[in-house]
């Protein structure tokens, strides 16, 4: 249940604190590498990488076609890595095709990167299982 909090609507202009913020001075956020694009085949595994660095430590969220990516046990997962985050999709289906975006923020700035995953019909590439063709 929601607790009502009586915060007066009378506005007192004393809220821009006149202090130099260490948080601001030391903060940075960098997209270290654009996200990879992948073309692969049905049944394969694809990995998309979001490579960011920053201070305070960035949080990363994944979107597919502008909707938040929902993890699926044993098939679709994302996890933190030393370089940012990795999204892995196993047993690919053509419905996995789409625009994948990672959005990273360190609390003070925002960066994002978008990659395309294209899952095609037909046999997998002959080079190696899970082969991904970046373009």
């Amino acid at each position: 249940q929601e607790t009502e909090l009586s915060v007066s609507a009378e506005l007192v202009p004393t809220s821009s604190w006149n202090i130099s913020s260490e948080l601001n001075k030391d903060s940075y956020l960098t997209l270290d590498e654009p996200m990879n694009n992948i073309t692969t085949s049905l049944g394969q595994t694809a990995e998309l990488h979001c490579k960011v660095s920053g201070n305070p430590p960035p949080t990363i969220r994944w979107f597919k076609n502008d909707a938040p990516v929902v993890q699926e046990p044993r098939r679709l997962s994302f996890r933190s890595t030393i370089y940012g985050s990795r999204l892995r999709i196993r047993n690919l289906d053509t419905t996995d095709t789409g625009y994948f975006q990672c959005v990273a923020t360190n609390g003070k700035e925002v960066v994002s990167s978008t990659g395309v995953l294209f899952v095609k019909f037909g046999p997998p590439p002959t080079a190696s299982p899970g082969y991904s063709d970046e373009y």
């Epitope: 821009s16 604190w17 913020s21 948080l23 601001n24 305070p56 430590p57 949080t59 969220r61 959005v103 923020t105 360190n106 609390g107 003070k108 700035e109 925002v110 960066v111 994002s112």
Partner: antibody, heavy 116, light 108 residues
């Protein structure tokens, strides 16, 4: 000294529009995302929208998507919130804040009242 | 969306006493939790970010702890100016960031 000064609030009828502004000074405006956070009378805080430093990325809470538009003019160090199709539940004090989700600088707020 | 639940809703204490405010998340937010103080008619003021880092200019009597789903803001010895409303806020799943409903700290 970082300063954020909101303006543009007022009384508007349901279905109406309003444009809020936030004039920023005392920091490198383009280096930071900027956000709007609101507070309904007697209630808690609610994040509304964020725009990246370049203006290329915009993000909204679900309840305002399609109705509100955040923008910035980096040449004027000013943040905007265009609010259309306003509803009674949008009544709140609207604060602009520096950052996307760690808000260490806030403006003094501007009150938006949606009522017939 | 991650829901933050603060307790108690109201805390009545006297100056000089120790205050312990709690914030619980509906799922893990790692250490990505902040605390804000708000006084009537003023904007919120950042106290703690990322669970335990004091913001610039915040007195040492304010400290934050916790990770995952359970967090605590502690004020070691209350000063008269500390009586206010306190909010927790997560940035783990941004966008959106979400706030708790607030704890009112009042003079006993």
């Amino acid at each position: 000294e970082v300063q954020l000064l909101e303006s543009g609030g007022g009384l508007v009828q349901p279905g109406g529009s309003l444009r809020l502004s936030c004039a920023a000074s005392g920091f490198t405006f383009t280096s930071y995302a900027m956000s709007w956070v609101r507070q309904a009378p007697g209630k808690g805080l609610e994040w509304v929208s964020t725009i990246s430093g370049s203006g290329g990325g915009t993000y909204y809470t679900d309840s305002v998507k399609g109705r509100f538009t955040i923008s910035r003019d980096n040449s004027k160090n000013t943040l905007y919130l265009q609010m259309n199709s306003l509803r009674a539940e949008d009544t709140a004090v609207y604060y602009c804040a520096q950052g996307s989700s760690i808000f260490d600088y806030w403006g003094q707020g501007t009150l938006v009242t949606v009522s017939s | 969306e991650i829901v933050l639940t603060q307790s108690p809703a109201t805390l009545s204490l006297s100056p000089g006493e120790r205050a312990t405010l709690s914030c619980r998340a509906s799922q893990s937010v790692s250490s990505y939790l902040a605390w804000y103080q708000q006084k009537p008619g003023q904007a919120p003021r950042l106290l703690i970010y990322d669970a335990s880092n004091r913001a610039t200019g915040i007195p040492a009597r304010f400290s934050g702890s916790g990770s995952g789903t359970d967090f605590t803001l502690t004020i070691s010895s209350l000063e008269p100016e500390d009586f206010a409303v306190y909010y927790c806020q997560q940035r783990s799943n941004w966008p959106p960031c979400t706030f708790g409903q607030g704890t009112r700290l009042e003079i006993k």
